[in-house]
């Protein structure tokens, strides 16, 4: 699966929450970032993530919400120079400092699900999605397309505004 072009087709800032309205938050600790799943009050500031959308080519037998052999992939960056990465060996989702071009581990296939929710499938490990496990983000294996609606891999994006630079 290859990214068509090295520039995103669009970018925007959004806050990310789980299907049951817990917020995905990020905290700098000892020069590395931690990712949390938290219950925030209505007046507590939601963390923002820069979503960069890329169009990718993929073989017709692969999953995804593409048309004519094209699908959307995203990278997610909560702060400058840091991106969410899939650590398939540890089944974890981590924040790493990276330089462009980003490694494949930073790309996720975007699936638009019901009720304005989305899911993020690891580019490097098809069938494995970002999900919530024990109040943390983790990589979760989804066995079949019927299980794509399982709530712990569904996320909501609350768009704030379009954004073209960090």
């Amino acid at each position: 699966m290859s990214i068509t072009g090295i520039s995103p087709i669009t970018e925007y800032l959004a806050s990310l929450s789980t299907y049951n309205d817990q917020s995905i938050t990020f905290a700098l600790e000892d020069e590395s970032y931690e990712i949390y799943v938290e219950d925030l009050k209505k007046d507590e500031k939601k963390d923002k993530v820069l979503l960069s959308y890329y169009e990718s080519q993929h073989p017709s037998n692969e999953s995804g919400d593409g048309v004519d052999g094209k699908m959307l992939m995203v990278t997610l960056s909560p702060t400058k120079d840091f991106w969410l990465h899939a650590n398939n060996k540890e089944h974890s989702v981590e924040l790493h400092k990276s330089e462009k071009p980003l490694p494949d581990q930073a790309f996720f296939v975007l699936h638009n699900m019901h009720s304005n929710s989305v899911s993020f499938e690891s580019k490097t490990d098809p069938g494995v999605f970002i999900g919530v496990k024990d109040n943390h983000l983790a990589l979760i294996k989804v066995d079949s397309s019927e299980n794509l609606s399982t709530e712990n891999i569904l996320f909501k994006l609350s768009e704030t505004h379009h954004h073209h630079h960090h």
Epitope: L40, K41, D43
Partner: antibody, heavy 121, light 107 residues
């Protein structure tokens, strides 16, 4: 479920010291400021100490400044209040409360059950 | 320091009655006000924050309103578990300060 459990209250003589503890669970402790509030028997509530989420900054009213020290151990999800040079007017129930997240939102969403400190000879 | 004046200090009321507690601040606090309930056993619970936002799990019979220096907490139809002490708190300016409290008691 968010829980704050206060402990360490006791009867002590004027001039002595006492250390209170508050163990937190059910939320990410290190992401929140924390506060101690007290209530003199039959009276109202008084804010007495706050600490930022990292523990780098602390705040006190004049009534306890220089005598009380708030601290926290984020590895143990525990808040402390070291009380020195205790006076009879420090007799109160002491509550720990979850304060704001970093510096956003509103304070004291959750409170401990309180621990009674009695200062008397 | 910002002073908060709660009134009345004691409020006798009957089950099913609608009651309102007032909190007046010595200077404008830009809606940075919370309301707390303290039960006789000492348990404290936040009911409302940002003047009018109801805490999740708090019954809809509670409501808050106000602006500038005048704020209020209303209970539309009193139930037995509502008889308690109520405190307002301003968090616009350090030191954050509480009102003196209102004791809601059964008439």
């Amino acid at each position: 479920e968010v829980q704050l459990v206060d402990s360490g209250g006791d009867q002590v003589q004027p001039g002595r010291s006492l250390k209170l503890s508050c163990v937190a669970s059910g939320f990410i402790f290190k992401n929140y400021w924390m506060t101690w509030i007290r209530q003199v028997p039959g009276k109202g509530l008084e804010w007495i100490a706050s600490i930022t989420n990292s523990g780098g900054n602390t705040y006190y009213p004049d009534s306890v400044k220089g005598r009380f020290t708030i601290s926290r151990d984020n590895a143990k999800d525990t808040l402390y209040l070291q009380m020195n040079s205790l006076r009879s007017e420090d007799t109160a129930t002491y509550y720990c409360a979850r304060d704001r997240r970093y510096n956003s939102g509103s304070p004291f969403a959750y409170w401990g059950q309180g621990t009674l400190v009695t200062v008397s000879s | 320091d910002i002073q908060l004046t709660q009134s009345p200090s004691t409020l006798p009321a009957s089950l099913g009655e609608r009651v309102t507690i007032s909190c007046r601040t010595s200077q404008s606090i830009n809606n940075n006000l919370c309301w707390y309930q303290q039960k006789p056993d000492g348990t404290v619970k936040r009911l409302i924050y940002s003047t009018s936002t109801l805490e999740s799990g708090v019954p809809s019979r509670f409501s808050g309103s106000g602006s500038g220096t005048d704020y209020s907490l209303s209970i539309s139809s009193l139930e037995s578990q509502d008889f308690a002490m109520y405190y307002c708190l301003q968090y616009a300016t350090y030191p954050w300060t509480f009102g003196g409290g209102t004791k809601l008691e059964l008439k």
